[in-house]
């Protein structure tokens, strides 16, 4: 139903705390360089204005759209052009073009320093002094670094953060209580960020239909007892929610997500037997819980998929009558039978089925033509299964760091033109798939591995889009989202690449490396590894292992030496010489 004042409506629905959090996230995601204080001031002004509209919906400007209200606020910021360059040109446009312009200027890789966590005592002091400001800083810092972070989910992570601090700041040993818990939240939030970015990419590049197909497959796997109409309803609503968040309509998105959670909890009987635990929780926890609820038990009496989609004499008639519905029912039926497949694989199978019907239904004898379609799925299914087996075996053999290095070598060979920091970030993220997925039960590995890899490769594509350097990467990133991972997996050494000349300074290290945290040390070593591969793209695994072992030994020796600086300056050049010889 239409409301006189959209801003009053959303304020009333969401409540002041969530309203303010979402407005702060929205501003931080649009203007990523502004300080927390600048955004906090705007948020307060917007909130005060919303309250006047709640009191009187007919008050001046209360009837304006949220885009107009928020855009006007952003465009009133002083020195916009100096700080943001051409983004200021957006302010010369009218809505809805102005908002589209803001969206186009979101930066997936802003030049902001890494978000450093203060030490425990300092954190607890500032948290106790002003919990609201502390959490506001958290929302601001995460949102500006992740401009597509799913806003209602970021509120959930902030709530988690709050609970951890409340608990740990009361303990004697704050550090050992906080560190593992906050690391856990950070890891989950980072995965949530790349997954949501993938959803927004799907929406932006291929439209709502593509996202809805993803949602149908995912929901059918999770709720195999819900009927097709129910799954389609949920997918339609979920598509709306995600479209709003990806489009910067964060208040509408959070409000509609709460509505969807409410609907699911009121209709558990027709959706799933596994929802009750989630539905007993408060709003943010409930919606988060529903988004990762365990799969319901599959119905025992499901007929073979072939009955309706291959053997039925009316396949072509049914397809012609309503293509989207027929393909939707195929995707639904196949997905509910295969919780052990990745969504990407299910969408590839549905695409194959559609292509087969398009071809066969135009022929003289369609059943003879599409009769073998299910057998033709086999290679499509085997390929990711082999990928999972090979990679999980390698992960179990090498451990996470070694597995990351193996991936780093592989991907540097595939796309040596890509910048070393991007390759290292990608390999570290891709390598985490082992820890995340390879320890799971067999039937959960494939969906975990492939859907996670797809999300990470989407980030690779986004970063590469800004500065395209590799034809290999451009080729894989230009196709459909579901074909990206197989495309990257199939890439081999780039034969067109002219190796980088050997520069001694790239492999020169100083004693400051010794005091770095383990993660930073690893990144330094992995940076050197990528540079080695760029110098010798066809170096064997043995050669690279020899060099890296030597490098690790050198660091170990010099970091234990009494005079570290002398050790680094004398042993460093020897290491460089040995490296060159080993790779010659």
């Amino acid at each position: 139903e239409a409301h006189k004042s959209e801003i009053a409506h959303r304020y009333n629905d969401l409540g002041e705390q969530h309203f303010k959090g979402l407005v702060l996230i929205a501003f931080s995601q649009y203007l990523q360089k502004c300080s927390y204080d600048e955004h906090a001031k705007l948020v307060q002004e917007v909130t005060d204005f919303a309250k006047t509209c709640v009191a009187d919906e007919s008050a001046a400007n209360c009837d304006k759209s949220l885009h107009t209200l928020f855009g006007d606020k952003l465009c009133a910021i002083p020195n916009l052009r100096e700080n943001y360059g051409e983004l200021a040109d957006c302010c010369t446009k009218q809505e809805p073009e102005r908002n589209e312009c803001f969206l186009q200027h979101k930066d997936d890789n802003p030049s902001l320093p890494p978000f450093e966590r203060p030490e425990a005592e300092a954190m607890c002091t500032s948290f106790k002094e002003n919990p609201t400001t502390f959490m506001g800083h958290y929302l601001h810092e995460v949102a500006r670094r992740h401009p597509y972070f799913y806003a209602p989910e970021l509120l959930y992570y902030a709530e988690q953060y709050n609970e951890i601090l409340t608990q740990c700041c009361a303990e004697a040993d704050k550090e050992s209580c906080l560190t593992p818990k906050l690391d856990g939240v950070k890891e989950k939030a980072l995965v949530s960020s790349v997954r949501q970015r993938m959803k927004c990419s799907s929406m932006q590049k291929f439209g709502e239909r593509a996202f809805k197909a993803w949602a149908v497959a995912r929901l059918s796997q999770t709720f195999p007892n819900a009927d097709f109409a129910e799954i389609t309803k949920l997918a339609t609503d979920l598509t709306k929610v995600n479209k709003e968040c990806c489009h910067g309509d964060l208040l509408e998105c959070a409000d509609d997500r709460a509505e969807l959670a409410k609907y699911m909890c009121e209709n558990q009987a027709t959706i799933s037997s596994k929802l009750q635990t989630c539905c007993d929780k408060p709003l943010l926890k409930k919606a988060h819980c529903l988004s990762e609820v365990e799969h319901d038990t599959m119905p025992a009496d499901l007929p073979a998929i072939a009955a309706d989609f291959v053997e039925d004499q009316e396949v072509c008639k049914n397809y012609a009558e309503a293509k989207d519905v027929f393909l939707g029912t195929f995707l639904y039926e196949y997905s509910r039978r295969h919780p052990d497949y990745s969504v990407s694989l299910l969408l590839r199978l549905a695409k194959k089925y559609e292509a087969t019907l398009e071809k066969c239904c135009a022929e003289a004898n369609p059943p003879a033509c599409y009769g073998t379609v299910l057998a033709e799925f086999q290679p499509l299914v085997e390929e990711p299964k082999n990928l999972v087996k090979t990679n999980c075996d390698l992960y179990e053999k090498l451990g996470e760091y070694g597995f990351q290095n193996a991936i780093l070598v592989r991907y540097t060979q595939k796309a040596p033109q890509v910048s070393t920091p991007t390759l290292v970030e990608a390999a570290r993220n891709l390598g985490r798939v082992g820890t995340k997925c390879c320890t799971l039960p067999e039937d959960q590995r494939l969906p975990c591995v492939e859907d996670y890899l797809s999300a990470i490769l989407n980030r690779v594509c986004l970063l590469h889009e800004k500065t395209p350097v590799s034809e290999h990467v451009t080729k894989c990133c230009s196709g459909s989202l579901v074909e990206r991972r197989p495309c990257f997996s199939a890439l081999t050494v780039d034969e067109t690449y002219v190796p980088k000349e050997f520069k001694a300074e790239t492999f020169t290290f100083h004693s400051d490396i010794c005091t770095l945290p383990e993660k930073e040390k690893q990144i330094k070593k992995q940076t050197a590894l990528a540079e080695l591969v760029k110098h010798k793209p066809k170096a064997t695994a043995e050669q690279l292992k020899t060099v890296m072992d030597d490098f690790a030994q050198f660091l170990d020796t010099c970091c234990k030496a009494a005079d570290k600086d002398t050790c680094f300056s004398t042993e460093g050049p020897n290491l460089v010489t040995r490296c060159k010889d080993a790779l010659a």
Epitope: D227, A229, E230, Y263
Partner: nanobody
């Protein structure tokens, strides 16, 4: 027994509008997805739209998107189809139908819509 009774059809000029209604009885209307299907003279069936019990629209045929709007009033056990910007190719018998799990299981008698100048 399940009964579906369509009304609202008739002759309309191109660019004009019509609103079809379907009165349902004999089943718990607000538990079922409902839809409209049409059959043009000498042609096969074409699905037009589907609506979930909650009122969420879950399907429009590409040929009617942006022109037709499906809706329902569960308190009145009635399904509607608002048809705007009608074209000659929309001429057909329009059937109201009840969806059950994976297909339509009950149909009305149909109402004829003729778009002609």
């Amino acid at each position: 027994e399940v009964q579906l009774l369509e009304s609202g059809g008739g002759l309309v000029q191109p660019g004009g509008s019509l609103r079809l209604s379907c009165a349902a009885s004999g089943f718990t209307f607000n538990h079922y997805t409902m839809g409209w299907v049409r059959q043009a003279p000498g042609k096969g069936l074409e699905w037009v739209s589907l609506i979930h019990p909650s009122g969420t629209v879950i399907y429009y045929a590409d040929s009617v998107k942006g022109r037709f709007t499906i809706s329902r009033d569960n308190s009145k056990n009635t399904l509607y189809l608002q048809m705007n910007s009608l074209r000659a190719e929309d001429t057909a018998v329009y059937y109201c139908a009840k969806w059950s799990s994976r297909a339509f299981d009950y149909w009305g008698q149909g109402t004829l819509v003729t778009v002609s100048s």
